[in-house]
């Protein structure tokens, strides 16, 4: 009965700093209202990136100031991270928690290494 | 650091109602879910019931179902249980516990308990 | 709901010695969604191990746990005398949340 969750091991983020990966879980219930956490792991501490709460069928709305978008199909979800440097590389979780109806069910990913590189400053130009 | 301070427990007739508080410092309340957890007297830990940080959802072990309600106060750093139609066998030290970041069920830091006996 | 059983339900062992705690579940639990707890007389619990075999912050390396699906255990590599206690299981997979009966590990 436990629920299991699959993520890309390795994700490279763009030169503006933008991540995407799947969230594929394997839902043990029929869950109406699902919940997906994105936190980062770094030196064993866990912090919390963004939260969203969907209900099945609908769309993954994450908060306006949240860093990250969201699409949800089935028992899969598409994450997209923005606003990424250099110094946020790093190992980040997906948690999948079926809320409702009862009972509760929890699952967690092996976590997705995303790694981020800084674009080179342009040279200056003489023209 | 993180502390965790139960207070409300007492002597009580089967039947009647109390409300524990477990006032909480040392960390931002508001983003961890919270627990309450029991010890009957020479027995082992039986969890009792959550809240989410946002206090959107809750869930209680069956054995308290209907009669015990979890609240929490974010603007007083406080979680409540209030017990309602106690029986005897409510009789236990109850402990409010922190939901890790992780997981809401792991309970990464305790109280250190209120007793609390149903007798007549 | 998902039952946990521990054994032995009492550990007689000397101080420098190795214990070694079992825990078995009713149903699969992940390995993911396993925890460890220690209690003394007259305290609160302390988390020991999550995830089965993630040591919690200020433990020392001396706890360790493994096992994965209904099978798991605590290891204790020498004990020393503030470990004599009670040690408990726990499940966080699913509600309800779920303890084993738990261990007491006393001196011989």
């Known amino acids: 009965k436990a629920m299991h969750v699959a993520q890309p091991a390795v994700v490279l983020a763009s030169s503006r700093g933008i991540a995407s990966f799947v969230c594929e879980y394997a839902s043990p219930g029929k869950a109406t209202e699902v919940r997906v956490t994105v936190l980062r792991q770094a030196d064993s501490q866990v912090t919390e990136v963004c939260a969203a709460t969907y209900m099945m069928g609908n769309e993954l709305t994450f908060l306006d100031d949240s860093i990250c978008t969201g699409t949800s199909s089935g028992n899969q979800v598409n994450l997209t991270i923005q606003g990424l440097r250099a110094m946020d590389t790093g190992l980040y979780i997906c948690k999948v928690e079926l809320m409702y109806p009862p009972p509760y069910y929890l699952g967690i990913g092996n976590g997705t290494q995303i790694y981020v590189i800084d674009p080179e400053p342009c040279p200056d130009s003489d023209f | 650091q993180v502390q965790l301070v139960e207070s409300g427990g007492g002597v009580v007739q089967p039947g009647r109602s109390l409300r524990l508080s477990c006032a909480a410092s040392g960390f931002t309340f508001s983003s961890y879910g919270m627990h309450w957890v029991r010890q009957a007297p020479g027995k082992g830990l039986e969890w009792v019931a959550v809240?989410?940080?946002?206090?959107?959802?809750?869930y209680y072990a069956d054995s308290v179902k209907g009669r015990f309600t979890i609240s929490r106060d974010d603007s007083r750093y406080t979680l409540y249980l209030q017990m309602n139609s106690l029986r005897a066998e409510d009789t236990a030290v109850y402990y409010c516990?922190?939901?890790?970041?992780?997981?809401?069920?792991?309970?990464?830091?305790w109280g250190q308990g209120t007793l609390v006996t149903v007798s007549s | 709901e998902i039952v946990l059983t521990q054994s032995p339900g009492t550990l007689s062992l000397s101080p420098g010695e190795r214990a070694t705690l079992s825990c078995r579940a009713s149903?699969?639990?992940?390995?993911?969604?396993l925890a460890w707890y220690q209690q003394k007389p007259g305290q609160a619990p302390r988390l020991l191990i999550y995830?089965?075999?993630s040591r919690a912050t200020g433990i020392p390396d001396r706890f360790s746990g493994s096992g994965s699906g209904t099978d798991f255990t605590l290891t204790i590599s020498r004990l020393e005398p503030e470990d004599f206690a009670v040690y408990y299981c726990q499940q966080y997979g699913s509600s309800p949340f779920t303890f084993g009966p738990g261990t007491k590990v006393d001196i011989k």
């Open positions: 995830g089965a075999s």
């Open positions: 149903q699969s639990v992940s390995s993911s969604y």
């Open positions: 516990a922190r939901g890790s970041i992780l997981a809401a069920g792991i309970f990464d830091y």
């Open positions: 809240i989410w940080y946002d206090g959107s959802n809750k």
